[in-house]
């Protein structure tokens, strides 16, 4: 099969490899204070950490990338840690006609992988 | 709107920002010579280059990540260049019963964005 088995144990030590981490941010941090009314403090789950060889490979392409990075590190970058899925988030915000509650599907990460 | 306009012109100079690049690889490079019969040389399109602020942002999450990276570079990584879509590739390979042609959907990148 084209898929080698992606690795799930981090060879770099705890917390070093690609994982989900919560970052607190205010509306001011995001430049959203002029249009978002609530929540005023956001808990943003983001993907952080390194992607050692075959760790949480997103797909065959990521496995190839990891292999070629080992052979040609100056030409081919290592896979990097990005969202594999997202959690919908509700924001209360201004609209032309008043205030609206709207769900955003691509705002907060729910899972991470190496792509 | 949650979406700032993603930027499409590279502020770092030609070829420096996230883009698609073709990398040639042999079956030996990939460790596939024992099961893939053809093609023996692959033209692998991969995503390479940097992701400066708001360049080709994949979505709102990527825009937030770029913004928070500017504020907390040690805590929040910059977005990175990953495939936004893939091109199907046909491989001729060995099977238990002989030889088969099979299409792989996640092997070669077709487009890139910053996630």
């Amino acid at each position: 099969s084209a898929h080698a088995h992606p690795r799930d144990s981090c060879p770099l030590g705890p917390g070093r490899c690609c994982h989900l981490e919560t970052v607190q941010a205010t509306l001011e941090d995001l430049g959203w204070s002029d249009w978002v009314l609530s929540p005023r403090q956001l808990q943003l789950s983001m993907c952080v950490g390194e992607c050692p060889h075959l760790y949480r490979s997103a797909n065959t392409h990521a496995q190839i990338k990891a292999r070629l990075h080992g052979l040609q590190p100056d030409k081919v970058p290592a896979p990097c840690c990005v969202p594999s899925s997202y959690t919908p988030v509700v924001l209360m915000h201004r609209t032309d006609s008043g205030v609206s509650l709207q769900t955003y599907d691509d705002l907060v990460a729910r899972g991470c992988h190496c792509a | 709107s949650a979406h700032a306009h993603p930027r499409d012109s590279c502020p770092l100079g030609p070829g420096r920002c996230c883009h698609l690049e073709t990398v040639q690889a042999t079956l030996e490079d990939l460790g596939w010579s024992d099961w893939v019969l053809s093609p023996r040389q692959l033209q692998l399109s991969m995503c390479v280059g940097e992701c400066p602020h708001l360049y080709r942002s994949a979505n709102t999450h990527a825009q937030i990540k770029a913004r928070l990276h500017g504020l907390q570079p040690d805590k929040v990584p910059a977005p990175c260049c990953v495939p936004s879509s893939y091109t199907p590739v046909v491989l001729m390979h060995r099977t238990d019963s002989g030889v088969s042609l099979q299409t792989y959907d996640d092997l070669v990148a077709r487009g890139c964005h910053c996630a």
């Epitope: 789950s45 959690t87 209360m92 205030v99 705002l107 | -």
Partner: antibody, heavy 119, light 112 residues
Amino acid sequence: QVQLQESGPGLVKPSQTLSLTCTVSGGSINSGGYYWTWIRQHPGKGLEWIGAIYYSGSTVYNPSLKSRVTISVDTSKNQFSLKLSSVTAADTAVYYCARGVEYQHFNEWGQGTLVTVSS
Amino acid sequence: DIVMTQSPLSLPVTPGEPASISCRSSQSLLHSNGYNYLDWYLQKPGQSPQLLIYLGSNRASGVPDRFSGSGSGTDFTLKISRVEAEDVGVYYCMQTLEAPPTFGGGTKVEIK
């Protein structure tokens, strides 16, 4: 339409821990933006906000109860829970779970459950 | 904590007539974004509270337009343009500017 349902013992002895669970149906507790909240109402009295938990597990509590309160979430069961330790008769109340956007807009409530603290 | 004070404590009303409830906060609820962080709730007899108004003047989904919220800073008013029999219950204001959110003591609306 999201529905919330409180469950737990209706009678708790003084000095013990009050434990309640709120089961969410018709929607995922994993949805961000919403704060899953506990509010109580003493008999014949007004409303008191106890605290809330966000889908990520971060919590915020009323300072007046903070030393005794723990709110947790079990996303696999689509539930969140309240524990209130060292209860006294003053903790006798109807306990409601509710869904809000941060500390406001509580547009979905459970039907409430009466908890009596008595020996 | 921000203290919320409601008046009157009890409000006898006649169906078809208007009604008005006052709410005062111990500090301004006006955020720098121009919105007042105040909600109004109605608790009908034997029921859970239900959201009527949020951010001072925005009617919640499904709330009849006879309900309106007004005011700014520390003084707020909930008006019912024409009271109906189903509007009886206890009305609460709640400040949402800062944690912990705090409720007023309630105003009991009953039919004369």
